[in-house]
């Protein structure tokens, strides 16, 4: 049930496809935190 945002994309997933499935405020927070970490050269939980 309790799930960290992934470090890497699963098969056939894009950032856009994940963005379209986010539901909670926490989901969006983790997603944008992940994006920020990705810009820095590595995925972030």
């Amino acid at each position: 049930k309790h799930k960290c945002f992934r470090n890497s994309l699963e098969n056939n997933e894009t950032l856009e496809s994940i963005m379209n499935t986010l539901e909670s405020e926490e989901d969006f927070r983790k997603y944008f935190y992940y994006l920020e970490g990705s810009k820095g050269g590595g995925g972030s939980k």
Epitope: K1, K3, T21, L22, E23, S24, E25, F28
Partner: antibody, heavy 119, light 107 residues
């Protein structure tokens, strides 16, 4: 404690409209996505729609797409399902349901409200 | 869409019996599977999430297992209050889909 209290069901003629409501309490409603699930008489459960936090994302089942609209009013802690162009096959008990987020299971359900579409 | 196939669709059992219900997904869903119990005229009740984790307040006689495409719900010792219909649901991707249900009846 978490409560989801539904209202708005009833009998309606084919082609007409109806709006269901789901009043939430006991949790931070505005922070979570909310779902509608329905169950036709004597049948199984069918997912209908979801609305995300802030209404950013909305998704619908193919069976209701273009006819039903999911919305929320965070100032009233209330979820809505606007049902237009109703058909006999939309007759069902409609449930609202909460989950913690993307890829989480439902943890709370409303009590259900019956919608009967009949002439 | 991911199809969820539940079996059996109904079963008869006695109090004290061990009951197993299976659910198969048409494609892999990791462990994003939930089980619900529903009694006539009532809303579904969440039993298990993540294929094997018990929801808060659910007795330990319920257990779930599986990953990928094949899953099971087991009731270790059936009690009178357990006679109900049970549904599995995948929440790996939209549209979220449910199994057809398994009605557990008194033998």
């Amino acid at each position: 404690q978490v409560q989801l209290v539904q209202s708005g069901g009833g009998v309606v003629q084919p082609g007409r409209s109806l709006r269901l409501s789901c009043a939430a309490s006991g949790f931070s409603f505005s922070s979570f996505g909310m779902h509608w699930v329905r169950q036709a008489p004597g049948k199984g459960l069918e997912w209908v729609a979801v609305i995300s936090y802030g209404g950013i994302n909305k998704h619908y089942s193919d069976s209701v797409k273009g006819r039903f609209t999911i919305s929320r009013d965070d100032s009233k802690n209330t979820l809505y399902l606007q049902m237009n162009s109703l058909r006999a096959e939309d007759t069902a008990v409609y449930y609202c349901a909460k989950r913690e987020g993307y890829r989480y299971a439902y943890d709370y359900w409303g009590q259900g409200t019956l919608v009967t579409v009949s002439s | 869409d991911i199809q969820m196939t539940q079996s059996p669709s109904s079963l008869s059992a006695s109090v004290g019996d061990r009951v197993t219900i299976t659910c198969r997904a048409s494609q892999g869903i990791s462990n994003y599977l939930a089980w619900f119990q529903q009694k006539p005229g009532k809303a579904p009740k969440s039993l298990i999430y993540g294929a094997s984790s018990l929801q808060s307040g659910v007795p330990s006689k319920f257990s779930g297992s599986g990953s990928g495409t094949d899953f099971t719900l087991t009731i270790s010792s059936l009690q009178p209050e357990d006679f109900a219909t049970y549904y599995c649901q995948q929440y790996n991707s939209y549209p979220l889909t449910f199994g057809g249900g398994t009605k557990v009846e008194i033998k």
